[in-house]
């Protein structure tokens, strides 16, 4: 199957990287993170029509079965294919520390 | 956050491994796979409520932002955390061959 990048639903409707501006309060982090105070969160949002950015064989199977049994099998879902790291200044028992999280910001997206 | 395994929506409603019985025709494989004729497809299906089988920090963020902006940010989605391999007997130009696919059957599930 083609691992297509052209969205048949119209521009911007299919699975792609979106940026959502969020504060520490929005993220539920205000009690343990000091900095940054605001984060540009990159995440994967959008529909996964047939053959669009299919991650693997499983995604192809899922789409075929979804067509057959839409009430039982959901369509593939738009999720991160990889992540970008992000460093946080966080509170600790003894003061503050730096910690890098490598599963926080989506880097690119695919359908699974 | 807890990486919980107890479904708050009731037994079997949350993200978990399901088995769907499918023929080669169902899968769209009839023209290139010879065997097996039928497959017990394991896939990840179910809701992803807060703190349920969260795959990583990104899933936590997504849930928090979904609560704040449900029309913009979807809830985390139930997808495979790992896969089981499967061997297919498939047609080739010169006859038949065995091919192992390692991204075909879901082994376990989580919410991303």
């Amino acid at each position: 199957a083609r691992n297509g990048d052209r969205c048949p639903l119209g521009p911007g409707r299919c699975c792609r990287l979106h940026t959502v501006h969020a504060s520490l309060e929005d993220l539920g982090w205000a009690d343990w993170v000091l900095s940054p105070r605001e984060v540009q969160v990159t995440m994967c949002i959008g529909a996964c029509p047939s053959q669009f950015r299919e991650a693997n064989m499983h995604a192809q199977i899922k789409m075929n079965l979804h067509r057959l049994k839409p009430d039982t099998v959901p369509a593939p879902c738009c999720v991160p294919a990889s992540y970008n790291p992000m460093v946080l200044i966080q509170k600790t028992d003894t003061g503050v520390s730096l910690q890098t999280y490598d599963d926080l910001l989506a880097k690119d997206c695919h359908c699974v | 956050a807890r990486n919980g395994d107890r479904c708050p929506l009731g037994p079997g409603r949350c993200c978990r491994l399901h088995t769907v019985h499918a023929s080669l025709e169902d899968l769209g494989w009839a023209d290139w796979v010879l065997s097996p004729r039928e497959v017990q497809v394991t896939m990840c299906i179910g809701a992803c409520p807060s703190q349920f089988r969260e795959a990583n920090m990104h899933a936590q963020i997504k849930m928090n932002l979904h609560r704040l902006k449900p029309d913009t940010v979807p809830a985390p989605c139930c997808v495979p955390a790992s896969y089981n391999p499967m061997v297919l007997i498939q047609k080739t130009d010169t006859g038949v061959s065995l091919q192992t696919y390692d991204d075909l059957l879901a082994k376990d599930c989580h919410c991303v």
């Epitope: 900095s35 940054p36 540009q40 970008n84 790291p85 460093v87 | -």
Partner: antibody, heavy 119, light 107 residues
């Protein structure tokens, strides 16, 4: 142009105080952190610490904790590294670097400030 | 603190050679490792971030790989301008630490 410009070379005597600077331009100074890195003559790079200019949070490497002070003045987009009492062993090149917390890397570096401490 | 050990500490190579530098962390740092290049009298320059991501503007002959404790920087075909000292740097958690450096010299 995005750049960090450091203050000029300094020659000091043991026991003297010193404050060197690192001025950011071409970007929003409070959107990035600033780190300081030491390089003693003929030696490798050593991470000293980091500051968030927007909140003035500082984190030091244990090797440098209590030996130096890192500060910033966001109103003039400048970070500082200072000593209250220099030692001969502080003789080194000091670099400031812009830290992108997205990606976690030092993408822009100052040209370095050479500090010489000698009696 | 996490110790970063680079090897070799120095190497001699010719233009066109494939060069590999390794870096080992004393404990797992996931992929939270960067590589920097430094030429004499100059500030370091970022080559690779997050173990394998090429920084914008860096030639594609540079590549990084590895995860956990073992990492590699590879220069596929050494160019005259690549003779320099290379440092790995872990930023998994503070205190961040550099490797001791690998000097790449002309054979």
């Amino acid at each position: 142009e995005v750049q960090l410009v450091q203050s000029g070379a300094e020659v000091k005597k043991p026991g003297e105080s010193l404050k060197i600077s690192c001025k950011g331009s071409g970007y929003s100074f409070t959107d990035y952190w600033i780190s300081w890195v030491r390089q003693m003559p003929g030696k490798g790079l050593e991470w000293m610490g980091i500051i968030d200019p927007s909140g003035s949070y500082t984190i030091y490497s244990p090797s440098f904790q209590g030996q130096v002070t890192i500060s910033a003045d966001k109103s003039i987009s400048t970070a500082y590294l200072q000593w209250s009492s220099l030692k001969a062993s502080d003789t080194a090149m000091y670099y400031c670097a812009r830290v992108s917390y997205y990606g976690g890397y030092f993408d822009i570096w100052g040209q370095g400030t050479l500090v010489t401490v000698s009696s | 603190d996490i110790q970063m050990t680079q090897s070799p500490s120095s190497l001699s190579a010719s233009v066109g050679d494939r060069v590999t530098i390794t870096c080992r962390a004393s404990q797992s740092i996931s992929n939270n490792l960067n590589w920097y290049q430094q030429k004499p009298g100059k500030a370091p320059k970022l080559l690779i971030y997050a173990a394998s991501n090429l920084q914008s503007g860096v030639p594609s002959r540079f590549s990084g790989s590895g995860s956990g404790t073992d990492f590699t920087l590879t220069i596929s075909s050494l160019q005259p301008e690549d003779f320099a000292t290379y440092y790995c740097f872990q930023l998994d958690h503070s205190p961040f630490t550099f490797g001791q450096g690998t000097k790449v010299e002309i054979k």
